[in-house]
């Protein structure tokens, strides 16, 4: 006959931090040395035995005299209420045929965590609980005095809960957020009427969720140490030492070795010299609440990240070539390195790849003379490319070479009694053609009428012009640029004995914001090209002199430069260059890139004032030095008369007042007789020039009173 195997000696212990009940019991009457499969049903009640809050089954194999263990976690802090536990059992083993029946319940075991025995009248639980963001948390208060009104607040906002008994109220906080690393504050205040009986707060420590490490990778630079790195993600450390930053551990499964890492995002692993080639690493991130891990499997020889090359040098450097040498840190015998060279200079970048064993060498060719280059090199394992090393670099400068192009030369010839004054100009050679620092220019002047006669003028750089006084002969002038290595090709220009073509008429042109568009008639006969030169009309020609070379088949060009300023007049001359390099003036043009209104008004004199007329004149007014072509003048006249004088028409001034206006369309007409006036009458006048852009500045009117008919002026 079967004995009911009732659970006995039930003991319940608690873990307040984990909010767990731990049950221990034994089963009496179990046959000696026999194992039975059994099911235990456990009941848990809260506050009173009739209030069952949890029922569950626990299946296990039971041995004779065995102490059984089972734990249960409460969502409610154990300090909030008394709990009761009982247990019954059922044999569920094939060795015993049906029917199986449940044993009697054990007696109720009462569990009370007395943390509210102090002098306070209000307690809040749990104290200093650590949870993960997104967790559901239950808190409670225990009030000694049921007459007290208790209000609770989460981060200053009142919360409402469920009363478990007259002394206890519980609050369910769903999916708690991370607010700050020193915790979330919750407090309750007990009061009677308007009198505070006490306040009690707790800190709920909410941790951010531990992330899986990202970008986990290991590599070696010397086959002695593996350097592993990862992105740790969010730091889950909390204040008050409640939870330190997460820890990181490396575990290698083939060797079974483990290492606690001391840095949050990297760890070094010593490679043992036992020829282990394959590594299987697990990186474990861990905090008080959870573990996260990530795995990598790799062959050591496929993860070589070399130290950067060293001893970068340049040998046999000349104007156009150099040999670049470098060394690499030798890490294994018969190791082949792939190296990449980058050459930066003159705004360009070239890239070359080379395979080496120990020392690197590369022949750099087609370099520019007198140029600073930056060359750098990086290397990698040629057999199993993993990643490039860091760059190692050095600057070097190629040697100078003789200038490769003749200077661009032009001239201004001015005729003076008995001679020519030739002002010679040249443009500095570009860096590309100078091939070094230009030290001086040689100007060789050869009299073509007396071939044996020549002069050499040496002009130190950076001068870009010189003045030559020559007699009325024909001259060939050569200009040569020199640096420390040698001389450039010569630039040749011929000055004719004949005077320049003075019959050329000057033509007015209008510029645009883009500059000046010029065209000309082709020069009769053979030409090797055209030259357009220009300068500021009002300035000394040497100050702002420019020129442009144009090909022989071109009869138009656009001169565009940022130097053109609004309101400035520029004079252009177009020359044809004959095969003998003699310049012939073809056309002259003048104009403004943008005309402006006149900057000043003429100084007007009043002449021959009579009782019926007066004469206005402004003979001294210069039309040349104006910010636009003066097209004429506006004469404004005010009088008491309602009607305007003949030739004058009504006009409204900018201030809204009315007057009479007369327009003079000839800029050289600088006088006007105003007649048909009344004696002893008061008149006012004002004269302003105008360009295509408008009138001159507004100014005050000048007052004139005609005398009586008997007066003589």
């Amino acid at each position: 006959e079967r004995l009911p195997l009732t659970p006995v000696s039930l003991k319940v212990s608690t873990n307040s931090t984990r909010q767990s009940l731990h049950l221990q019991w034994t089963v009496h009457n179990l046959p000696y040395h026999q194992e039975l499969k059994m099911v235990f049903q456990i009941q848990i009640s809260r506050i009173e035995t009739s209030n069952v809050i949890w029922v569950g089954n626990y299946s296990t194999t039971v041995k004779w005299n065995q102490v059984l263990h089972w734990s249960w976690e409460s969502e409610l802090p154990l300090e909030c209420a008394t709990h009761f536990v009982r247990i019954k059992s059922l044999v569920d083993d094939a060795k015993f045929p049906e029917p199986n029946f449940w044993s009697n319940w054990s007696s109720w075991e009462e569990v009370s965590v007395q943390d509210s025995t102090g002098q306070d009248i209000l307690f809040v639980f749990p104290k200093d609980k650590l949870v993960e963001e997104g967790t559901n948390v239950t808190i409670c208060y225990v009030s000694r005095n049921i007459q007290n009104n208790v209000s609770c607040y989460l981060e200053g906002k009142q919360i409402h809960g469920e009363q478990l008994d007259p002394h206890v109220t519980a609050f369910n906080l769903n999916s708690v957020p991370f607010i700050r690393n020193k915790g979330t504050n919750i407090y309750c205040e007990a009061s009677q009427g308007n009198v505070s009986e006490g306040m009690k707060g707790i800190v709920l420590f909410v941790s951010k969720v531990l992330e899986e490490p990202k970008d986990f990778s290991c590599e070696t630079e010397d086959f002695k140490t593996l350097h592993c790195t990862w992105d740790p993600g969010t730091d889950t450390a909390l204040g008050w030492s409640k939870q330190p930053s997460q820890s990181y551990t490396l575990f290698e499964s083939f060797s079974g070795e483990k290492k606690l890492c001391t840095h949050k995002n990297w760890c070094n692993w010593q490679i043992t010299q036992d020829s282990q080639e394959t590594y299987n690493f697990t990186l474990i991130a861990e905090n008080y609440l959870r573990k996260r891990s990530v795995n990598i499997l790799f062959n050591l020889t496929h993860r070589v990240y070399l130290m950067n090359p060293f001893s970068v040098n340049f040998e046999n450097v000349n104007a156009t070539n150099a040999i670049m040498t470098w060394k690499v840190h030798s890490i294994r015998n018969n190791f082949t390195y792939l190296c990449q060279i980058e050459l930066h200079g003159e705004g360009k970048m070239m890239q070359y790849n080379v395979s080496i064993k120990v020392n690197g060498e590369y022949f750099l060719s087609e370099l520019e003379p007198a140029t600073e280059y930056m060359a750098r090199v990086r290397c990698a394992d040629a057999s199993h490319f993993w990643k490039w090393s860091e760059w190692s670099g050095q600057n070097f400068t190629t040697l100078e070479a003789a200038p490769s192009e003749a200077p661009d030369v032009w001239r201004i010839v001015s005729l003076e009694p008995g001679n020519h004054t030739v002002t010679l100009f040249w443009k500095p050679l570009s860096k590309l053609h100078a091939n070094g620092k230009i030290l001086f220019y040689n100007v060789v002047v050869e009299n073509l009428d007396k071939p044996s006669s020549s002069e050499l003028h040496s002009i130190p750089a950076p001068a870009n012009s010189t003045k030559l006084i020559l007699d009325r002969c024909s001259y060939q002038i050569c200009v040569i640029a020199n640096n420390s290595v040698g001389a450039s090709p010569a630039s040749v220009i011929v000055i004719s004995a004949d005077p320049e073509n003075k019959e050329v008429e000057e033509e007015r042109i209008a510029g645009t914001e883009g500059g000046f568009s010029l065209s000309w008639k082709p020069q009769p006969g053979d030409v090797i090209g055209y030259v357009v030169d220009w300068c500021d009309h009002t300035q000394d020609v040497l100050g702002d002199f420019q020129w442009k070379n144009v090909g022989p088949n071109t009869t138009s060009t656009v001169i565009s430069t940022d130097a053109f300023r609004p309101g400035v007049r520029y004079d252009f001359r177009i020359y044809g260059l004959s095969t003998k390099r003699i310049a012939c003036l073809l056309e002259k043009k003048t104009g403004y890139s943008q005309e402006l209104a006149p900057s000043d008004n003429p100084h007007v004199l009043v002449d021959t004032l009579t009782s019926h007329s007066f004469t206005l004149s402004w003979k001294d007014y210069s039309t040349e030095s104006q910010p636009g072509f003066i097209q004429g003048y506006h004469v404004y006249l005010k009088s008491k008369a309602r009607q305007c004088h003949p030739r004058f028409e009504k006009a409204v001034l900018s201030d809204g007042s009315e007057c009479c206006k007369y327009k003079i369309d000839n800029p050289e007409e600088k006088a006007l007789i105003v007649d048909n006036l009344k004696p002893e009458s008061f008149y006012e006048f004002f004269i302003t020039p105008f360009t295509s852009a408008g009138e001159g500045p507004s100014a005050t009117f000048t007052k004139v009173t005609t005398p009586d008919e008997h007066s003589s002026m």
Epitope: Q119, D120, G156, R180, K182, N185, K200, G201
Partner: antibody, heavy 121, light 110 residues
């Protein structure tokens, strides 16, 4: 009835030491963080140090770090402040204050009457 | 030098409304609760307002607190002669890892 009574103040020479005590009653002492706050004559309040219910977390103002040590004895319901290398600027009325929470970063709902520390040669 | 800034003095006549300001930074008032303490002449400080605007039981409704950004203020309406005292604002400071106080405002009832 919550009571906090400070003692141990007095006149002391610069560079010397002093130990303040605070006897607590009327509440469950080991359930709360405790603090020391001082007030120089005619001046405002300055937090000096704080300690959590189980001494697991301790904090100090920069002005006293390395010189002052806070401690508690929950069995004796007492809070202490060991003050070493005292300076003239430490002269103040030292208050013992009770936090409303165990971890100690809320506010002080009860204060003692203070004990005067005078540092002078 | 106090971390939180208060006006040194304020005054009002009985029945009037008086406001005391307290300005700080992101690391204190900007991210933490503000508390106010009242210190009557010759006595220890007493908690007046906590969590920006919460009055402990027993503190008259005439006292109210508010916070905006990195500033807080204490308002006293219907001023009474017994309100003459020093008022201190306080908040936890995340940078200094401790509570910080204002320099205090002496309120005079005229």
């Amino acid at each position: 009835q919550v009571q906090l009574v400070e003692s141990g103040g007095g006149l002391v020479q610069p560079g010397r030491s002093l130990r303040l005590s605070c006897a607590a009653s009327g509440f469950t002492f080991d359930d709360y963080a405790m603090h020391w706050v001082r007030q120089a004559p005619g001046k405002g309040l300055e937090w000096v140090s704080g300690i959590s219910w189980n001494s697991g977390s301790i904090g100090y103002a920069d002005s006293v770090k390395g010189r002052f040590t806070i401690s508690r004895d929950n069995a004796k319901n007492s809070l202490y402040l060991q003050m070493n290398s005292l300076r003239a600027e430490d002269t103040a009325l030292y208050y013992c204050a009770k936090d409303i929470t165990s971890s100690g970063w809320y506010w002080f709902d009860y204060w003692g009457q203070g004990t005067l520390v005078t540092v002078s040669s | 030098q106090p971390v939180l800034t208060q006006p040194p003095s304020a005054s009002g006549t009985p029945g009037q409304r008086v406001t005391i300001s307290c300005s700080g930074s992101n690391s204190n008032i900007g991210s933490n609760a503000v508390n106010w303490y009242q210190q009557l002449p010759g006595t220890a400080p007493k908690l007046l307002i906590h969590s920006h605007n919460q009055r402990p039981s027993g503190v008259p409704e005439r006292f109210s607190g508010s916070k905006s950004g990195t500033s807080a203020s204490l308002a006293i309406s219907g001023l009474q002669s017994e309100d003459e005292a020093d008022y201190y604002c306080a908040a936890w400071d995340d940078s200094l890892n401790g509570p910080v106080f204002g320099g205090g405002t002496k309120l005079t009832v005229l």
